[in-house]
């Protein structure tokens, strides 16, 4: 038993670290693998992760953490039984990957304009709470052309936008995503997307 | 220093209730962990109580014999008691916080393992 | 739960000698097993972990193997500091349960 890929993982800054391999072969991964993450801090626990599958012969185990500081580095070690197969290092703070961002809500009972709302999916104490910029996503459902991303540099968690940019009559989705330039991080997963029936008033037009 | 402090303990009739409480200190806020509880009577070997999750799932396992009569609970990551209802003589003994590993398998199944760091116990005597 | 059952339950040994105790579990533990010293008066001190894994600063003479039901501590040569009780600790994936040995106290012959 070989690992082919060696593990890379990602932090949400938060509470958790995910991270994935690949194996030489179909692997059982629960019942074989033992991830073992201990945060390099005088007697600090060693704590065991059980991997889950990932496809055929990919893994993925979950490290939890009370909190992340970027100093933060834990040692992994990566077990088969009583054999060792791989040994390594993961510093957080090095390896973003923020948490998506949540409740995205449209609404459209602001005169002709449209305001997206969602949640920051970080508590205030948390360092990345004051950092994230986002990227808004907006397509039709019926018109796979009509595609565009409204990127949000403000802290805000909102975008305002004319319904006239849009096309009326017809049914739009959003969906909106994080980052955070201090961290050089990866994008967030996209959050839940919400649905809504576009329609505003065209303006008379005067001859 | 890291160090876990116990208090609480003392003199108390049977059929009475007392609340051990635990402060930990000196560790890594970074560090998720469980909060255990151990016992040991006059003379007797160790005995495992149950154990919290200092994180915010706060999960939660007992020894079989402890359901119902102990409870452990938690102020935040760094401070947990023990609650004893129903005291009897045979629950004389000294009490022990200590700090534990655990396994995880996902999220949202965490378990207890072995105990890292110990306090130095709190004595308690149940006699009338 | 689980049962441990430790043995002996008593030794008596001298210094330099090389001691063994053993540890069976009820059901399997893979490799969830750590050992314990226990001075009269005093806290237990974690000795191994993961059934063979030395925790911080415990010298070398101290060796843990096994996995799955059978367990084994291993002092290669007793030194006076070494006179205490230890104890297993088992602990069971299935029900979250941790349980100890009865203890193995290490008398000076």
């Known amino acids: 038993m070989k690992v082919l890929q060696e593990p890379t993982c990602v932090s949400d800054y938060m509470s958790i670290s995910t991270c994935e391999w690949k194996m030489n072969g179909p692997t059982n991964c629960s019942t074989e693998l033992r991830l073992l993450y201990q945060l390099v801090f005088l007697l600090s626990e060693a704590h065991t992760c059980i991997p889950e599958n990932n496809g055929g012969a990919g893994c993925v185990c979950h490290l939890l953490m009370d909190d992340v500081v970027s100093a933060d580095n834990y040692t992994l070690d990566l077990w088969a039984g009583q054999q060792l197969l791989w040994k390594g290092s993961f510093k957080p703070s090095e390896h973003v990957k923020p948490r998506a961002p949540g409740n995205l809500t449209v609404h459209t009972n602001v005169s002709d304009t449209l305001l997206l709302t969602w949640s920051n999916p970080y508590p205030p104490d948390n360092y990345l709470y004051n950092h994230l910029t986002y990227a808004v996503n907006i397509w039709s459902e019926n018109d796979p052309a009509d595609f565009r991303i409204y990127n949000v540099t403000y802290l805000e968690p909102s975008l305002r936008i004319a319904a006239s940019t849009l096309k009326s009559g017809i049914s739009y989705r959003a969906r909106v995503r994080a980052w955070a330039q201090c961290y050089n991080t990866t994008w967030s997963e996209w959050s839940p997307s919400t649905k809504w029936h576009n329609s505003y008033r065209e303006p008379f037009e005067q001859h | 220093e890291v160090q876990l402090v116990e208090s609480g303990g003392g003199r108390v009739q049977p059929g009475g209730s007392l609340r051990l409480s635990c402060a930990a200190s000196?560790?890594?806020?970074?560090?998720?962990?469980?909060m255990c509880w151990v016992r040991q009577a006059p003379g007797k070997g160790l005995e495992w109580i149950g154990c919290?999750?200092?994180?915010?799932?706060?999960?939660t396992y007992y020894a079989s014999w402890a359901k119902g009569r102990f409870t452990i609970s938690k102020a935040s990551s760094t401070t947990v008691y023990l609650q004893m209802n129903s005291l009897r003589a045979e629950d004389t003994a000294t009490y022990y916080c200590?700090?534990?590993?655990?396994?995880?398998?996902?999220?949202?199944?965490?378990?207890?393992?072995?105990?890292?760091?110990w306090g130095q116990g709190t004595q308690v005597t149940v006699s009338s | 739960d689980i049962q441990m059952t430790q043995s002996p339950s008593s030794l008596s040994a001298s210094v330099g000698d090389r001691v063994t105790i053993t540890c069976q579990a009820s059901?399997?533990?893979?490799?969830?097993l750590a050992w314990y010293q226990q001075k009269p008066g005093k806290a237990p001190k974690l000795l191994i972990y993961?059934?063979?894994t030395l925790a911080y600063g415990v010298p070398s003479r101290f060796s843990g193997s096994g996995s799955g039901t059978d367990f084994t501590l291993t002092i290669s040569s007793l030194q006076p500091e070494d006179f205490a009780t230890y104890y297993c600790?088992?602990?069971?994936?299935?029900?979250?349960?941790?349980?100890f040995g009865q203890g193995t106290k290490v008398e000076i012959k």
């Open positions: 200590a700090r534990a590993a655990f396994v995880n398998r996902g999220v949202s199944w965490i378990w207890p393992y072995y105990f890292s760091l």
């Open positions: 000196g560790f890594s806020s970074s560090s998720a962990h469980y």
């Open positions: 919290i999750y200092a994180g915010s799932r706060g999960s």
């Open positions: 059901e399997d533990i893979e490799s969830y």
């Open positions: 993961r059934a063979s």
């Open positions: 600790l088992g602990s069971s994936y299935s029900t979250g349960s941790n349980i």
